[in-house]
């Protein structure tokens, strides 16, 4: 299921005198497309241009991250008169052109979505025959990837004074809420750290002091589901103090 956010702009200005948009360069993309991790998403992009009946060589490009300078994730080229856009680059083989650039459509399909794909994408077209011209979407389309929670790490670590603390890190979108449960704990939200810079989908919760032996369970939940993982604390009281 792919959801596209349509721009329902309030009417700000006088009704315009319509000159045909086909006479100028423009690109139409939705502000946002949403899809679940593991699924596929379609990034729509259509354009108009001033070069009527252009059938020379063209290149279609999609970038990620930022316009004009971001890394290319997809590129294809069509020879003069050809409707086939031959793929020259498809990052990890997951990007495929759905649209026909000859018909002003650069729409892209992204397969097997991962949380790391959650970013902005920018379409670009280049004409290279008798006409040398190019155009790129400026604001791009934001691909919003949602995912049920997954606990990526759970561990017990030593603390000062022979104590122990537990850490639980989970990923998901929306970022999951984390809760710890365990001996003499009930249900505790613990010290939840905000998503880390550059790791927007990761959330970490710390249980600062494990006072009892037993099983400690971390639960991660968001609107798409929940996930659990447990660690066990057993202290062996030898000469060197407690250990796990």
């Amino acid at each position: 299921f792919v959801r596209t956010k349509i721009d329902t702009t309030e009417n700000l200005l006088n009704t315009e005198v319509h000159s045909s948009p086909a006479q100028r360069w423009s690109m139409q993309v939705p502000p946002e497309v949403s899809a679940e991790a593991g699924d596929a998403a379609v990034l729509p992009c259509t354009f108009t241009h001033p070069h009527r009946h252009y059938d020379g060589p063209l290149t279609a490009i999609w970038r990620a991250g930022e316009p004009y300078a971001g890394p290319q994730v997809f590129r294809c080229a069509a020879a003069r008169g050809s409707e086939l856009c031959q793929t020259a680059l498809s990052l990890h083989g997951r990007f495929r052109l759905l649209g026909n650039p000859r018909r002003n459509d650069l729409s892209l399909r992204v397969e097997r979505l991962a949380l790391a794909d959650d970013r902005r994408y920018f379409c670009r077209v280049e004409f290279a025959g008798d006409v040398h011209d190019r155009y790129e979407s400026r604001h791009g389309v934001r691909l919003h990837v949602t995912a049920a929670p997954r606990i990526v790490n759970i561990s017990v670590l030593p603390s000062p004074a022979h104590a122990f603390r537990a850490l639980c890190t989970a990923e998901g979108e929306p970022p999951p809420a984390l809760a710890w449960s365990g001996p003499a704990l009930g249900n505790s939200l613990a010290a939840v750290r905000s998503p880390r810079e550059g790791h927007g989908h990761l959330v970490t919760a710390e249980l600062p002091a494990l006072t009892h032996d037993g099983r400690y369970t971390c639960t991660a939940a968001n609107s798409l589901g929940r996930s659990e993982a447990s660690v066990y604390l057993f202290r062996f009281h030898g000469a060197s103090g407690a250990s796990t």
């Epitope: 702009t9 700000l12 200005l13 948009p21 100028r24 690109m27 939705p30 502000p31 004009y68 400026r138």
Partner: antibody, heavy 103, light 106 residues
Framework: CKAS????????MDWVKQRPGQGLEWIGE????????NYNQKFKGKATLTVDKFSRTAYMELSSLTSEDSAVYYC?????????????????WGQGTLVTVSA | ENVLTQSPAIMSASPGEKVTISCSAS?????MYWYQQKPGSSPKPWIY???NLASGVPARFSGSGSGTSYSLTISSMEAEDAATYYC?????????FGAGTKLELK
């Protein structure tokens, strides 16, 4: 730059500099829906754009101030953002903030 | 960057006179936008997407052009039109403004 009267997250917010008696210079823009920014290369490292969705406020922070930064700074809202064909230019402008840098 | 050159930089016109302000781009743009600014005030949207008048702009104003050459025209100058006019393009990064044309009443 506090916004009112429209859906704050639906429109990009831009910032424009105007030195005394001079023209307009575009600094950059931010999409309040996800805080994505696009800067004029000239102002990268000088200006940092942020938003607070809850208070519907856009912010610009200027660092390492010099006399060259003395100017009026405007926030301005684009008319639309789904494509450049529907882009209406800056339909709404703030009243401007005068920044004076003195030794 | 796409440099917008406005001409003339300063001009004066008598009431009733026709006025044309030009804006030349160093590379092709899809649409041109125009703003009016008076001393001590914020710029106001004046013409959007080359030829469309913003809300409240008198019908004596018009805009035209394509490619690298654009213009704003006042069919019959009035006192309230005295201001500085800026052109702006959005087709390439960074967004750029012209240096402005100061229109004075003769």
């Amino acid at each position: 730059c506090k916004a009112s009267g429209y859906t704050f997250t639906r429109y990009w917010m831009d910032w424009v500099k105007q030195r005394p008696g001079q023209g307009l210079e575009w600094i950059g823009e931010i999409d309040p829906s996800d805080s994505y920014t696009n800067y004029n290369q000239k102002f990268k490292g000088k200006a940092t754009l942020t938003v607070d969705k809850f208070s519907r406020t856009a912010y610009m922070e200027l660092s390492s101030l010099t006399s060259e930064d003395s100017a009026v700074y405007y926030c301005a809202r684009s008319g639309a953002y789904s494509s450049d064909y529907s882009y209406d230019g800056f339909a709404y402008w703030g009243q401007g903030t005068l920044v004076t840098v003195s030794a | 960057e796409n440099v917008l050159t406005q001409s003339p930089a300063i001009m004066s016109a008598s009431p009733g006179e026709k006025v044309t302000i030009s804006c030349s781009a160093s590379s092709s743009v899809s649409y041109m936008y125009w703003y009016q600014q008076k001393p001590g005030s914020s710029p106001k949207p004046w013409i959007y997407r080359t030829s469309n008048l913003a809300s409240g702009v008198p019908a004596r104003f018009s805009g035209s052009g394509s490619g690298t050459s654009y213009s704003l025209t006042i069919s019959s100058m009035e006192a309230e039109d005295a201001a500085t006019y800026y052109c702006q393009q959005w087709s390439s990064n960074p967004l750029t403004f012209g240096a402005g044309t100061k229109l004075e009443l003769k």
